[in-house]
Interface confidence: low
Amino acid sequence: DWVIPPISCPENEKGPFPKNLVQIKSNKDKEGKVFYSITGQGADTPPVGVFIIERETGWLKVTEPLDRERIATYTLFSHAVSSNGNAVEDPMEILITVTDQNDNKPEFTQEVFKGSVMEGALPGTSVMEVTATDADDDVNTYNAAIAYTILSQDPELPDKNMFTINRNTGVISVVTTGLDRESFPTYTLVVQAADLQGEGLSTTATAVITVTDTNDNPPIFNPTTYKGQVPENEANVVITTLKVTDADAPNTPAWEAVYTILNDDGGQFVVTTNPVNNDGILKTAKGLDFEAKQQYILHVAVTNVVPFEVSLTTSTATVTVDVLDVNEAPIFVPPEKRVEVSEDFGVGQEITSYTAQEPDTFMEQKITYRIWRDTANWLEINPDTGAISTRAELDREDFEHVKNSTYTALIIATDNGSPVATGTGTLLLILSDVNDNAPIPEPRTIFFCERNPKPQVINIIDADLPPNTSPFTAELTHGASANWTIQYNDPTQESIILKPKMALEVGDYKINLKLMDNQNKDQVTTLEVSVCDCEGAAGVCRKAQPVEAGLQI
């Protein structure tokens, strides 16, 4: 049987080497000479030769200093043979434990740790965590028992101990109130990790803490009074630029300004925010009226996109806006005037007066009237009074100039301001109908075939309006009824059918047709009738010598 005491060897031992560790014995040495040898890691496998054994005495020796952090345990096998080389024992496992020395200092996992904390964070708020490791034995010794401390804080303001570090975990927390990004946006801590629970080897690292923004500063007007001027009637005109400062982080919701006009019930102004520099751009939302109000004193408040984190006073500014008078065009009242007038209205008589008002009540101005568009040249206007009268006969049935019984004229009014301003009014003459048009036939030229002639429809047209139109009355005159007949084509008597009574010779005929409207206004029209050498429905045929209708009776 083997006799092997437990084996341990401290790392980093001084020489001289080789150094005895233990003496190995086999009980078989009582029966004869025993020779010892070892195999395994550190003996005959790498690292070779760290351990040796005296062949005859069994003394196990170490030949060089050990490093626990490289190899903490060696596993060897001891062998015993007799002088003839036969094994007298089974090989025995030998464990050599390398005991730890505090030969490694802690190492931080990063040279610089980065963290952040909200300004105004309360004590106890966790900020970040730093971590260090130590290669030494943390199971059987305190050689890797790390304790964390803060060595320094830069700046040491507003208190030199703004933060604390958990000695065991490395978690950094806020310990003092007063974190203010606007005063001290970053803190640099030098943190230490020391083994032996803080009493041994140490190392340092840097923790950089960024203080993040909260909306704890209001935007403030600077200056708080502004002046601007704007011409009347112009919308979207920049009046002035409002300046604010906000100590919070630029281009964040806590910095971005929101402007509110406190006394603009009419919504006549608007303030937009310049996203680049946070300026307030005051503009007109709609045109202002100098004659109504010459000056506005606006009170503008400024806040941020997000609510204030703490109770803050809202900054206000006063803006005096002067409205500048502009010469405005006279305004016709109404802008479109409708006048009903009979088409037989007397020439030279006054139809109506159409006048404009001068908006510039603060300027004494004279208005002059002119007719701008009068396509039929029917009208004239008094340049001083705006009285409009006829210069020629009106005609409702002048369809070139009259649409839907309405004649449109444009009137202009010009003031004597500087520069001159001109306003336009529209005059609509609604022309009432007079029965001044008799009915007429359409067509007036008609073709029949000599054989089996097809009756022809003649429409009756009257340019007037009801009741000066249908039902019409038609009558053949001057003996035309001898050869021709007419009958009404429809109940409204707006068309008739003409046909010959008998076979007619090829040739041209004139037929006198008397047409009368519902108000008994009549007119005799001569129809040009051609009888052609054809049968049934006639197209246009060659002209023959005219035959007077009266001669054909």
Partner: antibody
Framework: EVQLLESGGGLVQPGGSLRLSCAAS????????MSWVRQAPGKGLEWVSA????????YYADSVKGRFTISRDNSKNTLYLQMNSLRAEDTAVYYC??????????WGQGTMVTVSS | QSALTQPASVSGSPGQSITISCTGT?????????VSWYQQHPGKAPKLILS???KRPSGVSNRFSGSKSGNTASLSISGLQAEDEADYYC???????????FGGGTKLTVL
């Protein structure tokens, strides 16, 4: 003890108006932004409106913009919600809540608003 | 802006742990550490249980914890108890006029 107590709820016809109040006690009311949050029957929570501690800034959900107005009277420790042009979809329990570091705390017990013809 | 996304329901047995997620965008959950969680029992007002992702107000059990990764925040409840059965809502501060977004709510059932 911190307390918020809403009142002013009730039945109103579509197109009608109501004014809710929320009386605060037990904390410095003027230092707190305040919000109204509503909960339709059987539904989830919906933020409606918020106002800064000073009353200078107001915020509205798109669904109520132009119809509801939030205001506060710090001298009376009271928050208000003026609701105009009410619609059936505005039917809900309305809660007032303190608003800081944006979260809602404390909460009132709620007041029921029913919009129905 | 649409609501934050929460699962409609989760369940667990007494003593177990559960997690409720709350997913938003880089304009809300991802942009700020202003995520809060609320517990609401039927017929009662909501109660703040976590603010600024993981901060517990005084009086709230340490069984409630919060975390955030990217655009998703999470509420974890360990050692489930019968009284934890309630609706849970997340909120996030958001860029723009909406100010505060709510999640759709998650019904927690303790089996």
């Amino acid at each position: 003890e911190v307390q918020l107590l809403e009142s002013g709820g009730g039945l109103v016809q579509p197109g009608g108006s109501l004014r809710l109040s929320c009386a605060a006690s037990g904390f410095t009311f003027s230092s707190y932004a305040m919000s109204w949050v509503r909960q339709a029957p059987g539904k989830g929570l919906e933020w409606v409106s918020a106002i800064s501690g000073s009353g200078g800034s107001t915020y509205y959900a798109d669904s109520v913009k132009g119809r509801f107005t939030i205001s506060r009277d710090n001298s009376k420790n009271t928050l208000y919600l003026q609701m105009n042009s009410l619609r059936a979809e505005d039917t809900a329990v309305y809660y007032c809540a303190g608003t800081a570091k944006p979260s809602f705390d404390p909460w009132g017990q709620g007041t029921m608003v029913t919009v129905s013809s | 802006q649409s609501a934050l996304t929460q699962p409609a329901s989760v369940s667990g047995s007494p003593g177990q742990s559960i997690t409720i997620s709350c997913t938003g965008t880089s304009n809300d959950v991802g942009a700020y550490n202003y995520v809060s969680w609320y517990q609401q029992h039927p017929g009662k007002a909501p109660k703040l249980i976590l603010s600024e992702v993981n901060k517990r107000p005084s009086g709230v059990s340490n069984r409630f914890s919060g975390s955030k990764s990217g655009n998703t925040a999470s509420l974890s409840i360990s050692g489930l108890q019968a009284e934890d059965e309630a609706d849970y809502y997340c909120t996030s501060y958001t860029m723009g006029s909406t100010f505060m977004l709510f999640g759709g709510g998650t019904k927690l059932t303790v089996l």
